[in-house]
Amino acid sequence: LEVSESPGSIQVARGQPAVLPCTFTTSAALINLNVIWMVTPLSNANQPEQVILYQGGQMFDGAPRFHGRVGFTGTMPATNVSIFINNTQLSDTGTYQCLVNNLPDIGGRNIGVTGLTVLVPPSAPHCQIQGSQDIGSDVILLCSSEEGIPRPTYLWEKLDNTLKLPPTATQDQVQGTVTIRNISALSSGLYQCVASNAIGTSTCLLDLQVISPQPRNIG
């Protein structure tokens, strides 16, 4: 018995179905086929879970969280024992193993391993201004999404005037910040933060209004 090489890693957007491949060759009939799918969750590597089981011509549910979401892609028994997972969740991310036995065919590689990563687009980021908006001050524009896998990167842009950040601006795409030093009237305007990762983007807006000093009456 020989389980074929798997693609190694599969990525899927949260909520979408995933197919985890596992095929094998055997010299024996499929009368005594036994297939166990296990997962080692990324969130709990010390606690492997059973996903689905085929034994004695019957299918059995694995861990409760997979109930109603998991099944074999084809009619069993077969040499293609790939499974699907519907409505993928973040907690489905992990390393999946198919263990195949088909007596009396013993020996060879009877395990296939496939990694599953469930991706999450950035949630709507939160935009805020840190610091005084008085002319001549330094301000920081902050942007962060609570959700996003892979971790989002952040790009600040200006949506009015010359369509670019002031030359005194320094951008950090990882932290989601823009520091604008020595703000002037030209720094005023509409700023947009774009949070993006491999599967999506999300935006938020900030209206920066630089405050000019009020003339004081000397009496």
């Epitope: 010359t162 369509l163 670019k164």
Partner: antibody, heavy 121, light 110 residues
């Protein structure tokens, strides 16, 4: 090497469409606002359209508004100009240009070599 | 016609000084920065001056810029044969959300 390279120009009939591309290399593409500028044969420079670093903001010259669309793909470091309902007066060399991050005002510090668009029947 | 007015042509002898004007209004030059470009025959334009009077690295100090009210001026001293080119000013109008070039000035070195 820091450069911009336009492509997609050619001969097109009046009323037709064309999409120009501008491939950038050697700098952090998404940090820069970009523009398309054109020059009709024997004439001066004419600004056509501009787009912000993330693509969220864009401006157009009155002469192309409603017919041309500027866009960018930051994952491919590429700027585009979709030109529809082309007219004979759109015949020109089209340049893409980068707006300097060192300037408060508009200042195109990097230009492509240009691509020729000819609108003729 | 461009909303920024430049003289169609200027000329001067080598070693001399020349100025090129760019005239606009309060909606463009009057409230915004100006940049200047040199275009040699058959080539793409090149940035000479930005933010009214700043020179990018590599631009010789023979080139200078200034702005007063609704007009901007490019100055070139110690004229050289290789300065023969077309020169353009550029600014933007906040209200119209457009960038605008001047009509261009052809500089001839006699």
């Amino acid at each position: 090497e820091v450069q911009l390279l336009e492509s997609g120009g050619g001969l097109v009939q009046p009323g037709g469409s064309l999409r120009l591309s501008c491939a950038a290399s050697g700098f952090t593409f998404s940090f820069y606002s970009l523009s398309w500028v054109r020059q009709a044969p024997g004439k001066g420079l004419e600004w056509v359209s501009a787009i912000s670093g993330g693509g969220g903001g864009s401006y157009y010259a009155d002469s192309v508004k409603g017919r041309f669309t500027i866009s960018r793909d930051n994952s491919k470091n590429t700027l585009y100009l979709q030109m529809n309902s082309l007219r004979a007066e759109d015949t020109a060399v089209y340049y893409c240009a980068r707006d300097s991050r060192d300037a408060y005002g508009v200042a195109f510090d990097l230009w492509g070599q240009g691509t020729m668009v000819t609108v003729s029947s | 016609a461009s909303v920024l007015t430049q003289p169609p042509s200027v000329s001067a002898a080598p070693g001399q000084k020349v100025t090129i004007s760019c005239s606009g209004s309060s909606s463009n030059i009057g409230n915004n920065y100006v940049s200047w470009y040199q275009q040699l025959p058959g080539t793409a334009p090149k940035l000479l001056i930005y933010d009214n009077n700043k020179r990018p690295s590599g631009i010789p100090d023979r080139f200078s810029g200034s702005k007063s009210g609704t007009s901007a001026t490019l100055g070139i001293t110690g004229l050289q044969a290789e300065d023969e080119a077309d020169y353009y000013c550029l600014t933007w109008t906040g209200a119209g959300r457009i960038f605008v070039f001047g009509g261009g000035t052809k500089l001839t070195v006699l």
